[in-house]
Interface confidence: medium
């Protein structure tokens, strides 16, 4: 197989080095020749020629292949011209010759993938590998080949991507800094707690890929899918040169699903304790796990230890809403929080679902606000509410919804950020229900919506005749 990798080498005498401490040279002869016919001689400048011990192997339909492996590491020297020539001993003739630099004929053995597992975000995959010759790993670049493992379609799309070793994996940005909040003050960003539509994943060809030494992070994969992957390496062409080696044996990995599918929502009320909840699946049990990470970059060869999230009793606040599983844990404000939910179905199959990582200050849930009103004139209401958290008044936004009695549809209003009240024009002689909810959405704190306040019933007065 390695011979085929050297096919583009037009030299009759082909040579390669796996680790730059070894050298193998070979050539093919169509005609069979008696043992001892050929000698492979080599010499560095100003040194006496030496013979390299030859072995031969019969090549069906091709004749004989003669192979020499340099016997001593001390004989394999870099950045220095090595003269090689094949001599027919009986005819005292040079059959073929070449001059090469060992540092330019690298053909690295494939790395062995030692771990492949989901990364810290849905659709991410972290892999680690072991380099057969670790001392040269700084001078190699890597290429990854992967594709979806689909038993029904063995010719699924394959992606080949060069691993960019100079970048660590993407920093876990604080999602949605102030600049992301320009539209409406309460525009719902895609947050770990968002129970909204799944974002479309980037096309596989655009999958981001980064590496750090012997580990690499791929993103943009489809959560919940299975993938196969292979790795190969090539000298970087700066210090050491050569060709791409062969691909490693394929490994397969099952990516966790996206916990958005379970409606995962995590929040804190006190910036100390975090509660997570997700929809309970039919005929299945589930368990939440968490871990904290300080690393903004991919930790090399470090795999998280997931801790149990302490279960709470199942809640079923209303018949229409699905039953939720809840759990809670103590958190820290100096690290990123990662959540995993494992769902075990009746036959005992375990499905994992990964939440998007978040900081505790991005998951602050406010208490339900209190709504007060008074009618100034017929149908003209003045509304007032207390900020549930005075410490973040300027970062609190509200939604007010109302509906006429007997109506199912709600009208939703968004007062300006930080407002403490407002006015509302309603039809006279009508009955309404009003509700208010709040959430943090500023540069310091963000979080999910509070629950809606208890419905406030309003009956507007008859029009006053002037």
């Amino acid at each position: 197989q390695d011979v085929s990798l050297l096919a583009s080498d037009s030299e009759p005498l082909k040579c390669f080095s796996r680790t730059f401490e070894d050298l193998t040279c070979f050539w093919d002869e169509e005609e069979a020749a008696p043992s001892g016919t050929y000698q492979l001689l080599y010499a560095y400048p100003r040194e006496k020629p030496r013979a390299c011990p030859l072995s031969s192997q019969s090549m069906p339909h091709f004749g004989t292949r003669y192979v020499c492996q340099f016997p001593d590491q001390e004989e394999v020297r870099l950045f220095f011209p090595l003269h090689l020539w094949v001599k027919n001993v009986f005819l005292n003739q040079t059959r073929t010759q070449r001059v090469l630099f060992v540092d330019s004929v690298g053909l690295p053995a494939p790395p062995s993938i030692i771990k492949a597992m989901g990364g810290s975000q849905p659709g991410e995959l972290q892999i680690s590998w072991e380099e057969p010759a670790p001392e040269i790993s700084d001078f190699l670049r890597y290429e990854l080949r992967y594709g979806p493992r689909d038993p029904k379609n063995s010719t699924g799309p394959t992606v080949i991507q060069l691993i960019a070793t100079e970048t660590c994996c993407p920093a876990l940005q604080r999602p949605h800094s102030a600049s992301a909040l320009d539209q409406s003050p309460c525009a719902q960003p895609t947050m770990p707690w968002q129970d909204g539509p799944k974002q479309t994943s980037p096309s596989r060809e655009a999958s981001a890929l980064t590496a750090e030494g012997g580990s690499c992070l791929i993103s943009g994969l489809q959560p919940g899918n299975s993938y196969w992957l292979q790795l190969r390496s090539e000298p970087d062409g700066i210090s050491l040169g050569g060709s791409w080696g062969s691909w490693s044996l394929p490994v397969t990995v099952d990516l966790p699903g996206d916990a958005v599918a379970l409606g995962l929502q995590c929040f804190t009320l006190d910036l100390k304790n975090v509660t997570c909840q997700w929809q309970q699946q039919d005929h299945a049990s589930s368990q939440g796990f968490f871990y904290h990470s300080r690393a903004r970059c991919c930790p090399r060869d470090r795999y998280p230890i997931w801790e149990n999230c302490e279960e709470e009793e199942k809640t079923n606040p209303g018949l229409q809403t699905p039953q939720f599983s809840r759990c809670h844990f103590k958190s820290r404000n100096d690290s990123i929080i990662h959540i995993l939910v494992e769902v075990t179905t009746a036959p005992g199959t375990v499905h994992s679902y990964l939440g998007s990582p978040f900081w505790i200050h991005q998951a602050v849930r406010l208490p339900t606000p209190n709504l007060h009103w008074r009618e100034i004139s017929s149908g003209h209401l003045e509304l007032e509410w207390q900020h549930p958290s005075s410490w973040a008044a300027q970062e609190t936004c509200y939604q007010l919804r109302y509906t006429g009695e007997g109506h199912q549809d709600w009208k939703v209003l968004e007062p300006p950020l930080g407002a403490r009240g407002g006015t509302l024009e309603l039809r006279p002689r009508s009955r309404y229900r009003l509700q208010l909810r709040a959430r943090l959405n500023g540069p310091t704190y963000q979080g999910p919506w509070s629950s809606w306040s208890d419905p406030t019933r309003v009956e507007t007065a008859t029009e006053t005749a002037w």
Epitope: V76, R77, L78, F80, E135, I136, S239, L240
Partner: antibody
Framework: QVQLVQSGAEVKKPGSSVKVSCKAS????????ISWVRQAPGQGLEWMGQ?????????WLAARANSRVTITADESTSTAYMELSSLRSEDTAVYYC????????????????????WGQGTTVTVSS | EIVLTQSPGTLSLSPGERATLSCRAS???????LAWYQQKPGQAPRLLIY???SRATGIPDRFSGSGSGTDFTLTISRLEPEDFAVYYC?????????FGQGTKVEIK
């Protein structure tokens, strides 16, 4: 981390000899070359020669200095020496020893000495 | 012997500016064996870059090296007051080892 420590300043008469030492700490001499470089006042850097430690000691000298320079080493003390004879006033310079990879190193030799390391310099003044 | 020619001889720049120093070899040099040094008056040369592009220990990342074959470049992305000095390139892949004549980077 290899460090090279050189002997102190010397003042010499024309026609005499000077022997400058360069001691390696934190590593042995094998696997790399000790080069000698000099810099006359206000001038650039001039390579004088090197001693290559390996299976056999090999001395390489720049053509200009050839006959007057001798480079030796004492492996037991990890010290290299550069002796310059028949001193002239134009030999007044700062003499540096530098550890560099050998020519045609094995991979391990190259990895051990990829980054050059220099001594602090020895000032030699030749004056009557 | 391989002759290294540095250009320009003198570079007059202000702090904060970008400096680009060139080193041209009379024949091909292995990238693994090209180094850049900084030297200030009365001091030994200080290794900045080895192997054409690898930064030596403790060298700030405003210094970067590039190039291969016969053309090599040292770039200082933003000159700091302490960067004004003489810079030498050196090849140590082929005996005799040789140095460029130096480029002086001075304050404008």
């Amino acid at each position: 981390q290899v460090q090279l420590v050189q002997s102190g300043a010397e003042v010499k008469k024309p026609g005499s000899s000077v022997k400058v030492s360069c001691k390696a700490s934190g590593g042995t001499f094998s696997s790399y070359a000790i080069s000698w470089v000099r810099q006359a006042p206000g001038q650039g850097l001039e390579w004088m020669g090197q001693l290559i430690e390996g299976p056999t000691l090999r001395q390489w000298l720049a053509a200009r200095a050839n006959s007057r320079v001798t480079i030796t080493a004492d492996e037991s003390t990890s010290t290299a020496y550069m002796e310059l004879s028949s001193l002239r006033s134009e030999d007044t310079a700062v003499y540096y020893c530098a550890r560099l990879p050998i020519e045609g190193p094995t991979l391990r030799q190259w990895l051990a000495a990829r980054a050059p390391v220099w001594g602090q310099g020895t000032t030699v003044t030749v004056s009557s | 012997e391989i002759v290294l020619t540095q250009s320009p001889g003198t570079l007059s720049l202000s702090p904060g500016e970008r400096a680009t120093l060139s080193c041209r070899a009379s024949q091909s040099v292995s990238s693994s064996y090209l180094a850049w040094y900084q030297q200030k008056p009365g001091q030994a040369p200080r290794l900045l870059i080895y192997g054409a592009s690898s930064r030596a220990t403790g060298i700030p990342d405003r210094f970067s090296g590039s190039g291969s074959g016969t053309d090599f470049t040292l770039t200082i992305s933003r000159l700091e007051p302490e960067d004004f000095a003489v810079y030498y390139c050196q090849q140590y892949g082929s005996s005799p080892w040789t140095f460029g004549q130096g480029t002086k980077v001075e304050i404008k």
